[in-house]
């Protein structure tokens, strides 16, 4: 006799408001008396729809959570596996049960804010910026909101950066324990004549940090040819370990690039009548902190002020 | 007596491959999830793939996705974890683990003795 | 993901002693939650599952407790054999199938 589950009921995704952070929801299935004490567990497949691959979970829980691209619609599918305990080593699993959230179609594309760019500070403020969207009337302004993990609700920008009196950006500081998760941003509009698309985006702070370039560059040359240049990592919050550097170094006419994660460097001079010795730094935060980043500006030119001409009598 | 024996570790230069296999007895080897554990010396325990009885789903933890590769025979009551492209990061005591009971992973009701892969230049 | 917090990292306890550990999931995990003995140089060692359930062979004064988030272990009177690194683990929800980091009891 063939074992059979029953899908669960009810599946659902549902948007509590975070801007895009959805309730993926669903009831046990009915369950036939004889399997009332087993493990249910369930597979989820989930997806925006424009992507090529599910995201799979297993869980024996009722709800799943996750965030998504709101630009695009979402679909899911899922499924009750019974325990192997309970089937005698067979594999069983109910057919799937799916489920969508469409997005709202509120508003034409082109009323949508274009370049939205956004960029961590020193990990200490957020500045986010865009341009208003290809076709949109003069009265149109915009208006952001963001939310991640730890706040109650999603909140409004509280400082606009303003061009013509309208919002072209926003800053955000005090962003207590907002690294290393999504950060949703939602820019929506508002026009007396047309309805205006609102427009998502999702990072995690800490792949947008820009630091602030590297300071105090000193350099010396000891035995006429080992040159030594040291840095110090800039003032601020990110830990001296999360920095990775860029050297500029110019030998006369002749430039090359090395990196390090250390905030010093030698290497040998190229020429021993070289009459001009500098270096610049920036920085950007690695790796081992980071999955990408920002590189700073550049930071000031240090030069060897060392070398004596013939002339310097 | 069930019995997990891992085999296949050793050291391997940044870049290469190495497969390991897991041979067990002691119990009917197509029925439960098996996985893969790993601990890092001095480190705690960090779950590193699953796979369901019959072989046909695979799970993967991040930090591994797309450069490991699960897969069983249950004809010959062996596991195995084929891993690619290998970082010092995946040096490591791996475990082969059989699953107590469900789908993909629960609670790991009996571990191999371990076989330890270094990555180094 | 569902992380795991143990406390404390480190235990200090003398022979006789009740031992409690516990372990924090980021969100709710029902009841499946697992619990492993590890000693030095050995593959870890199933102690409890589904949050109180006491795998077959393991003595009595191991018992678990807990559910939703907050979990704990307890040795009501702690054996000379005890001393080893505790871990806690969830089933609930995976990819991926997450680990608390561990506690080491130590004699005191």
């Known amino acids: 006799l063939e074992i059979k589950v029953n899908p669960p009921q009810d599946f659902e995704i549902l948007d509590p408001g975070l801007l895009g952070y959805l309730y993926l929801q669903w009831k046990p299935p009915v369950v036939i008396e004889k399997f009332k004490g087993c493990t249910l567990e369930y597979e989820l497949k989930y997806r925006n729809v424009d992507s090529d691959s599910w995201k799979t979970i297993i869980t024996r829980n009722l709800i799943y959570k996750d965030g998504f691209d709101l630009n695009k619609g979402i679909e899911g599918k899922i499924r009750t596996h019974l325990s192997e305990h309970c089937t005698n080593g067979s594999e069983v699993q109910s057919p799937w049960i799916e489920a969508s959230y469409g997005i709202s179609d509120e508003g034409s594309l082109e009323t949508k804010i274009q370049d939205m760019k956004c960029i961590y500070y020193n990990w200490q403020y957020l500045v986010c910026s865009w341009k208003p969207g290809k076709t949109v009337y003069s009265d149109t302004n915009y208006t952001m909101f963001f939310w991640y993990e730890g706040l109650d609700h999603a909140l409004q920008c509280a400082d606009y950066l303003q061009h013509d009196e309208k919002n072209v950006g926003c800053k955000l500081s005090n962003l207590d324990s907002s690294d290393y998760k999504d950060f949703f941003i939602c820019v929506n509009g508002s026009s007396k004549l047309e309805p205006i698309r609102s427009s998502y985006t999702v990072f995690q702070l800490q792949n947008i940090v820009k630091p602030l370039p590297p300071e105090f560059l000193h350099i010396s040359v000891e035995n006429s040819i080992d040159i030594r240049m040291k840095w110090s990592t800039p003032g601020g919050p990110i830990p001296p370990r999360c920095y990775t550097y860029e050297i500029v170094i110019r030998e006369d006419d002749i430039s090359w690039e090395s990196a390090t994660d250390k905030n010093d460097m030698k290497l040998k001079r190229r020429a021993n009548e070289s009459e001009d010795l500098c270096f610049f730094v920036r920085c950007k935060v690695n790796i081992y902190c980071a999955d990408d980043g920002i590189w700073s500006e550049w930071s000031e030119e240090e030069c060897w002020e060392g070398y004596t001409g013939p002339d310097s009598k | 007596e069930v019995q997990l024996l891992e085999s296949g570790g050793g050291l391997v230069q940044p870049g290469g491959s190495l497969r390991l296999s897991c041979a067990a007895s002691g119990f009917t080897f197509r029925r439960p999830a098996m996985t893969w554990v790993r601990q890092a010396p001095g480190k705690g325990l960090e779950w590193v793939s699953a796979i369901t009885g019959s072989g046909g789903s695979t799970y993967y933890a991040d930090s591994v996705k797309g450069r490991f590769t699960i897969s069983r025979d249950n004809s010959k009551n062996t596991l195995y974890l084929q891993m690619n492209s290998l970082r010092a990061e995946d040096t490591a005591v791996y475990y082969c683990v059989k699953v107590r009971y469900g789908w993909g992973a629960g609670a790991f009701d009996y571990w191999g003795q371990g076989t330890l892969v270094t990555v180094s230049s | 993901d569902i992380q795991m917090t143990q406390s404390p990292s480190t235990l200090s306890a003398s022979v006789g002693d009740r031992v409690t550990i516990t372990c924090r999931a980021s969100?709710?995990?029902?009841?499946?939650l697992a619990w492993y003995q590890q000693k030095p140089g050995k593959a870890p060692k199933l102690l409890i599952y589904d949050a109180s359930s006491l795998e077959s062979g393991v003595p009595s004064r191991f018992s678990g407790s807990g559910s939703g988030t907050e979990f704990t272990l307890t040795i009501s009177s702690l054996q000379p054999d005890d001393f080893a690194t505790y871990y806690c683990?969830?089933?609930?929800?995976?990819?991926?199938?997450?680990f608390g980091q561990g506690t080491k009891v130590e004699i005191k």
């Open positions: 969100q709710s995990i029902s009841s499946w």
């Open positions: 683990q969830q089933y609930d929800t995976y990819p991926p199938i997450t």
